[in-house]
């Protein structure tokens, strides 16, 4: 079965930046990744970045880059500042569309008893949506 | 299909505004950004910027900023592309698009004239 | 910004004619993550919008004829037309798909000899 992880980590340097990671351990191939903050895309959350393997990045404020790590993991890097800044228990979701499981989407947030620049290894985080 | 429907040609004057639309069939409109692009002959094809119908998330080219406004109406599917204080420069065809520019509306004919 | 640069501005060819056309690129386009290259092709023709042929550097829109191939990577890219028609008569843009903002190369406009 198809998993998702999530990973988010406060950089040291700037309390108010932070970085996501997640990846799919699937056999399938990538078409297209989605991550939103706030919950699931489509739930009440909203899109932080769009990325295609081989059409192009999209992404908005206040994600600064979002970019692919692997053939099957991305990263996104968030600048804090002002109103559209994330805070310490916020929600980041990916979703990841892959043919032919279908989508598969979870989310994670920064562990409660994380320093700065700290942050728990990459584990599958509870698959929340599979849409078949 | 994926289909993008834009509004009419507009003949206005120097210091005026006009609003562009662009209506999405076909697709989730809220999933995709939309495009915006400008059209002059002899100047090629310049992004203007985009918009992401669900949260109306938008992205500017530095160059239109001040002169382009983008908003989008999920419940309509249709995103509007406003331009202010038209001078001849702006005269020019302007698309919309979609899906990493896969698609495109028709265009529509901005004449900027006194 | 990444300028694209195009080259030749225009072309003149036969029918049945190979053609290749150039565009570089003043930043890489590679994505390292996932070694896939952010470029696009169009080709436009007169009254109407520009039509998505390449992306990714190399991989067809659907649609696509299989006479149109798309090479390269880094900052140097090739659009080659292995047997030109008359319907392919058309100026054909590249475009960074990389970084915002996305922009276009000035064109490269393909006539009949």
């Known amino acids: 079965t198809p998993e998702v992880w999530v990973q988010v980590r406060m950089e040291a340097t700037e309390l108010s930046s932070f970085t996501i990671r997640c990846g799919f351990l699937g056999s399938g191939s990538i078409s297209l990744v989605t991550v939103s903050w706030g919950g699931p895309n489509g739930a009440g959350g909203t899109t932080l970045a769009v990325l295609h393997p081989e059409r192009g990045i999209r992404q908005w404020a206040p994600a600064r880059q979002a970019r692919w790590e692997t053939q099957s993991s991305i990263s996104l890097i968030l600048e804090g500042s002002g109103a559209s800044s994330p805070c310490a228990n916020t929600t980041f979701c990916c979703k990841f569309a892959s043919f032919p499981e279908g989508s598969w989407e979870a989310c994670g947030s920064l562990p409660p008893s994380s320093d700065p620049g700290l942050s728990a290894p990459p584990t599958p985080a509870p698959i929340l949506r599979a849409d078949l | 299909q994926v289909q993008l429907q834009q509004s009419g040609a507009e003949l206005t004057k120097p210091g005026a505004s006009v609003k562009i639309s662009c209506k999405a069939t076909g697709y989730t409109f809220s999933t995709f950004a939309i495009d915006w692009i400008k059209q002059r002959p002899g100047h090629g094809l310049a992004w203007i910027g985009e918009?992401?119908?669900?949260?109306?998330?938008?992205n500017y080219n530095e160059k239109f900023k001040g002169k382009a406004t983008f908003t989008a109406d999920t419940s309509s599917n249709t995103a509007y592309m406003h331009l202010s204080s038209l001078t001849s420069e702006d005269s020019a065809v302007y698309y919309c698009s979609t899906y990493w520019f896969a698609y495109w509306g028709q265009g529509t004919l901005v004449t900027v004239s006194a | 910004d990444i300028v694209m640069t195009q080259s030749p501005s225009s072309l003149s060819v036969s029918a049945g004619e190979k053609v290749t056309m150039s565009c570089k690129s003043s930043?890489?386009?590679?994505?390292?993550?996932?070694?896939?290259?952010?470029l696009a092709w169009y080709q436009q023709k007169p009254g109407q919008p520009p039509k998505l042929l390449m992306y990714g550097a190399s991989t067809r829109e659907s649609g696509v004829p299989d006479r149109f191939t798309g090479s390269g990577s880094g900052t140097d890219f090739t659009l080659t037309i292995s047997s030109v028609q008359a319907e392919d008569l058309a100026v054909y843009y590249c475009?960074?798909?990389?970084?915002?903002?996305?922009?276009f190369g000035a064109g490269t406009k393909l006539e009949l000899k």
């Open positions: 930043q890489s386009l590679l994505n390292s993550g996932n070694q896939k290259n952010y």
């Open positions: 918009i992401l119908p669900g949260g109306n998330n938008t």
């Open positions: 475009q960074n798909a990389h970084s915002y903002p996305p922009a």
